[in-house]
């Protein structure tokens, strides 16, 4: 199997952004977890949220309120998440890891662009 | 490289106050929620208090509700918890830690001692 | 407030032995559970969170498992280094608590 995401994701200011994550499997292939953290040069990684198959969606605190599961009907197999109201300072890089049976772990990183409209006056 | 140093321990007498400080570096400070734990002498981990990313909240464990506050300034990286009416039962060596929703890096611990 | 416990409170085992270490939570913790290691005069370190997700740096010798209320931490092959006390704590309620701690002594 392999993730499917994108490179960059752009969204307008306090738009959703939608971080797309899909495990396309082989028949039988069962996600486990899907765990979504920022990850910065030199920072390590900050936990945004946890999907898990039996427990549901968990949100760390930093981001509780913000991450949310896009709307059903859902596949097994996706882990996309939206991050609410997109602020210039969550544009940056975005991992999701993926857990899988019995493959074993999948990673992928995208990009989140954050554009401020600027408007003119004349 | 993500450091946690803390300052501020001390003997004081019971009743009296304490400012703790912590000074992060290495990370973006002003993204993450932060916490102090403490550690009495020769006993177990304890949850005292935790602070938002922004400052605007904050909650204390049972046992020092009232008596302990909890800040942050994002401009300088430091962290501040100011402790008053101190009891015997509040020595310890008190740890800032940084939420990652469980606690990913831990300061060195400053020991605070309440004796008269 | 949800109560963490863990055993044996101390564990006394032979340098390259298995030691296996329980926690117990009061209620579901789900998969929120940490693990971290405390050697004397030092901060705690973390282990493992996400039940058995290892952190940057943790030797495979380290290994977690359970979910729910019932968890275990396996130190396989015990070093010199692994000598100390383990804590678990979780991390799905507030207030976050931890276990008493277990001791991991040579034997």
């Known amino acids: 199997g392999e993730l499917e995401t994108s490179d960059v994701v752009t969204v307008v200011l306090g738009q959703d952004a939608k971080l797309p994550c899909f495990y396309r499997g082989d028949s039988g292939e069962q996600v486990g977890q899907v765990a979504w953290a920022r990850v910065d040069a030199g920072e390590g990684a900050q936990e945004l949220a946890l999907l898990h198959s039996k427990y549901g969606l968990h949100v760390s605190p930093a981001y509780e309120g913000r991450v949310e599961q896009p709307p059903p009907p859902r596949n097994p197999l996706d882990g996309s998440v939206l991050l609410r109201n997109a602020v210039q300072a969550d544009e940056g890089e975005y991992e999701c890891r993926v857990s899988t049976f019995p493959a074993g772990s999948f990673q992928a990183r995208l990009r989140l662009r954050v554009l401020v409209h600027h408007h003119h006056h004349h | 490289e993500v450091q946690l140093v803390e300052s501020g321990g001390g003997l004081v007498q019971p009743g009296g106050s304490l400012r703790l400080s912590c000074a992060a570096s290495?990370?973006?400070?002003?993204?993450?929620?932060m916490h102090w734990v403490r550690q009495a002498p020769g006993k177990g981990l304890v949850w005292v208090s935790r602070?938002?990313?922004?400052?605007?909240?904050?909650n204390y464990a049972d046992s020092v509700k009232g008596r302990f506050t909890f800040s942050r300034d994002n401009a300088k990286n430091t962290l501040y918890l100011q402790m008053n009416s101190l009891r015997a039962e509040d020595t310890a060596v008190y740890f800032c830690?940084?939420?990652?929703?469980?606690?990913?890096?831990w300061g060195q611990g400053t020991l605070v001692t309440v004796s008269s | 407030e949800i109560v963490m416990t863990q055993s044996p409170a101390t564990l006394p085992v032979s340098p390259g032995e298995r030691a296996t270490l329980s926690c117990r939570a009061s209620?579901?913790?789900?998969?929120?559970l940490a693990w971290y290691q405390q050697k004397p005069g030092q901060a705690p370190r973390l282990l493992i969170y996400?039940?058995?997700t290892r952190a940057t740096g943790i030797p495979a010798r380290f290994s977690g498992s359970g979910s729910g209320t019932e968890f275990t931490l396996t130190i396989s092959g015990l070093q010199s280094e692994d000598f100390a006390v383990y804590y678990c704590?979780?991390?799905?309620?507030?207030?976050?608590?931890f276990g008493q701690g277990t001791k991991v002594e040579i034997k």
């Open positions: 830690v940084r939420d990652n929703w469980y606690f990913d890096y």
């Open positions: 290495g990370f973006t400070f002003s993204r993450y929620w």
């Open positions: 602070i938002n990313s922004d400052g605007s909240s904050s």
């Open positions: 209620q579901s913790v789900s998969i929120n």
């Open positions: 996400g039940v058995s």
């Open positions: 704590q979780q991390y799905n309620n507030w207030p976050r608590t």
